[in-house]
Interface confidence: low
């Protein structure tokens, strides 16, 4: 069907006049409002028919739709129909008369209705109200259509503006009736099978006594039909179900299950979709990675979780330093695998008050007959740092030597500092860092060893003072990301005696 | 006032798909009538695809005819583009605009959004 001109909508001049051609490979005619108009039909030198429809001095009161429709059985599709909307703005027209049954809007359930208030010209502003209450109501508004929208049983008038005066429509009257309305519900036991596993999906309704199930599913393409078993659930309320049941899955039985509930009394119907994937093999693939090194903090709990999708249900292991773990007695380390959808999984190591033995290399793996996959990761135990001893020496040379160990988990980093001033020391006064320092006054060397059996760092770092003159304070202090530790001692010179 | 808001744009590969939203907003919105322009640098604003509320009355411009499709939300006071087999040439800025006349004409809307930009590689 091919129009001209186009549209497929058109704002006329009043008075104006104005020609449809509709054209087509068979005979076609002109609708308006269900009625056939005045039009000339024809069929042309080339074999095509057309029907040309001459709207003459047009008025406010030709504003409407218009169709082109095929007007015999001959058409190569029956339901095919094009339309085009025609306004002819008419300022002595306010809305667009309405019959009498129109007035009367009767709404079946709490679904979106119109209110038919039409005017002929696009460009006016249309509010709609209740009768009772001049605020418009915000309600989207169609210039062919009128307002769309929910509404309660009220009555309802629609407002615009021609030029300066007011125009109020016709009163519209909304009814609700009572009807049960449908509530389908469709499962199916698995979304996902492997082929030769069955599928069985469940389509119920509650509180509906005479329905109709319909199905639709891919097997209908090749038209092998399924015959699926009604199953009546007596109770309050009462339910029907329609079971449709394949016994072994194929791999084109993936695709959409609709069923389609209609209940005859009242033309009410409603369908529900599910997608089932049938699949060759299992599958077990992780959803979130974890990065390598994980940190936990000394005496602190820490759950490491890890996320994958499988089918069909995979079984669980973890492992430390390839060494099967399983849930202590003692309740230090918990193991759970949750299943959080159909084909999804949380597996989960909380380790509960860890201890620095914890520290190494864990693995998850999760797999069945037709997949697998592990996920491996270092576990950090960080251990404060302390302070275990802070010595001095005093060599012939004359030369003060300060020893500092300290162990902690990161690597600390050791800071030297010396306050020469006690009395205001430390508090008053920030004292001055310490190390190797040009004029060679002192000489600092720090030595790093990394405990395996501890997981540990231990620091030990010696400062060399070459030349003591007065008492002084001097700090170590180590640090790492877990806090900090330090601890002092009052260096003399080797001349002065020195009493607390 | 009204406001619109388009979203959606981006960079997409010859043959590929897009989904534009445009969402209308303000404290009274009374047009009927909204449509998607879209513009290249240096040249008019092009008629791409237009929609009264019922979705009843639609009109696309032929270039993106079979390929584009307008389509609208009353509760969201929504319009959306679904744009597939996108192709060089669709590379713009597509603009999103509301008025009272179903028209190609870019003088019949009174509102416009800023524009997102589509970009369709070869």
């Known amino acids: 069907l091919v129009i001209t001109p186009p549209g497929p909508e058109f704002v006329l001049n009043i008075s104006s006049t104005f020609v449809l051609t509709c054209s087509s490979s068979a005979p076609v005619m002109w609708e308006q409002m269900s009625q056939v108009p005045w039009q000339e039909a024809a069929m042309n030198q080339d074999g095509t028919f057309s029907s040309v429809l001459t709207l003459t001095n047009v008025t406010g009161g030709d504003t409407g739709e218009y169709f082109c429709v095929y007007n015999n059985s001959l058409g190569p599709e029956l339901s095919e129909r094009k339309r085009i909307y025609i306004f002819v703005p008419d300022p002595t027209m306010g809305f667009l008369p309405m019959d009498s049954e129109d007035l009367f809007i009767f709404v079946t359930d709490v679904t979106e209705t119109t209110i038919p208030c039409r005017v002929t010209d696009p460009q006016l502003e249309v509010t709609l109200h209740e009768k009772k209450v001049d605020i418009p109501l915000h309600v989207p508004y169609d210039h062919q259509r009128g307002f769309i929208g929910t509404f309660e049983d009220k009555t309802y008038i629609c407002k615009t503006t021609i030029g300066d005066r007011e125009v109020d429509s016709d009163t519209y009257y909304v009814y609700s009736l009572q009807v049960s309305s449908i509530n389908v519900s469709v499962n199916a036991v698995q979304t996902v099978v492997r082929q030769g596993e069955s599928i069985t999906i469940r389509c119920i309704v509650m509180g509906n006594d005479v329905v109709n199930f319909q199905w639709t599913y891919p097997r209908m393409k090749s038209g092998r039909l399924v015959e699926p078993v009604t199953d009546y659930l007596f109770g309050v309320p009462s339910r029907i179900g329609s079971i449709l049941h394949i016994p072994t899955a194929e791999l084109s039985d993936s695709g959409t299950y609709t069923c389609n509930v209609s209940v005859s009394v009242n033309d009410h119907g409603d369908e529900k979709a599910i997608n089932v994937t049938v699949i060759e093999n299992g599958y077990v693939r992780l959803l979130e990675t974890l990065e390598d090194v994980q940190i936990a903090e000394l005496h602190r709990s820490r759950t490491l979780q890890v996320v994958f999708e499988a089918y069909p249900t995979p079984s669980v292991l973890w492992f430390k330093d390839n060494r099967t773990l399983g849930d202590s007695s003692a309740g230090e380390l918990v193991l759970s695998t949750r299943n959080v959808s159909e084909t999804r999984y949380v597996s989960e190591l909380t380790l509960v008050r860890v201890k620095v033995s914890e520290a190494g290399y864990y693995t998850m793996r999760a797999f069945h007959a037709d997949d697998q996959v592990q996920l491996s990761f270092k576990l950090q135990v960080n251990v404060p740092v302390r302070v275990l001893e802070l010595s001095e020496s005093h060599p012939a040379n004359g030369e003060q030597i300060l020893r500092c160990r300290g162990r902690g988990m990161p690597q600390p980093n050791v800071t030297w500092s010396t306050c020469r001033d006690l009395k205001r020391c430390p508090r008053k006064l920030s004292p001055t860092p310490l190390g190797n320092s040009s004029k060679e006054e002192s000489q600092l060397e720090t030595n790093v060893t990394f405990w395996e059996e501890d997981q540990e760092y231990e620091v030990v770092s010696t400062l060399r003072l070459r030349h003591v003159d007065q008492p002084l304070s001097v700090r170590c202090m180590l640090q790492n990301s877990m806090g900090r530790d330090s601890q002092e001692v009052t260096v003399v010179p080797h001349s002065l005696p020195f009493k607390v | 006032e009204v406001q619109l808001v388009e979203s959606g744009g981006g960079l997409v590969q010859a043959g590929g798909s897009l989904r534009l939203s445009c969402a209308a907003s303000?404290?009274?919105?009374?047009?009927?009538?909204m449509g998607w322009f879209r513009q290249t640098p240096g040249k008019e604003r092009e008629f791409v695809a237009a929609?009264?509320?019922?979705?009843?009355?639609?009109h696309y411009a032929d270039s993106v005819k079979g390929r584009f499709t307008i389509s609208r939300d009353h509760a969201e006071n929504a319009v959306f583009l679904q744009m597939n087999s996108l192709k060089p040439e669709d590379t713009a800025v597509y603009y999103c605009?509301?008025?009272?006349?179903?028209?190609?004409?870019?003088?019949?809307?009174?509102?416009w959004g800023q524009g997102t930009q589509v970009t369709v590689s070869s």
């Open positions: 303000g404290r009274s919105f009374s047009s009927s009538v």
């Open positions: 605009a509301a008025g009272n006349y179903l028209d190609t004409a870019q003088y019949r809307y009174n509102y």
């Open positions: 929609t009264r509320w019922t979705a009843a009355s639609t």
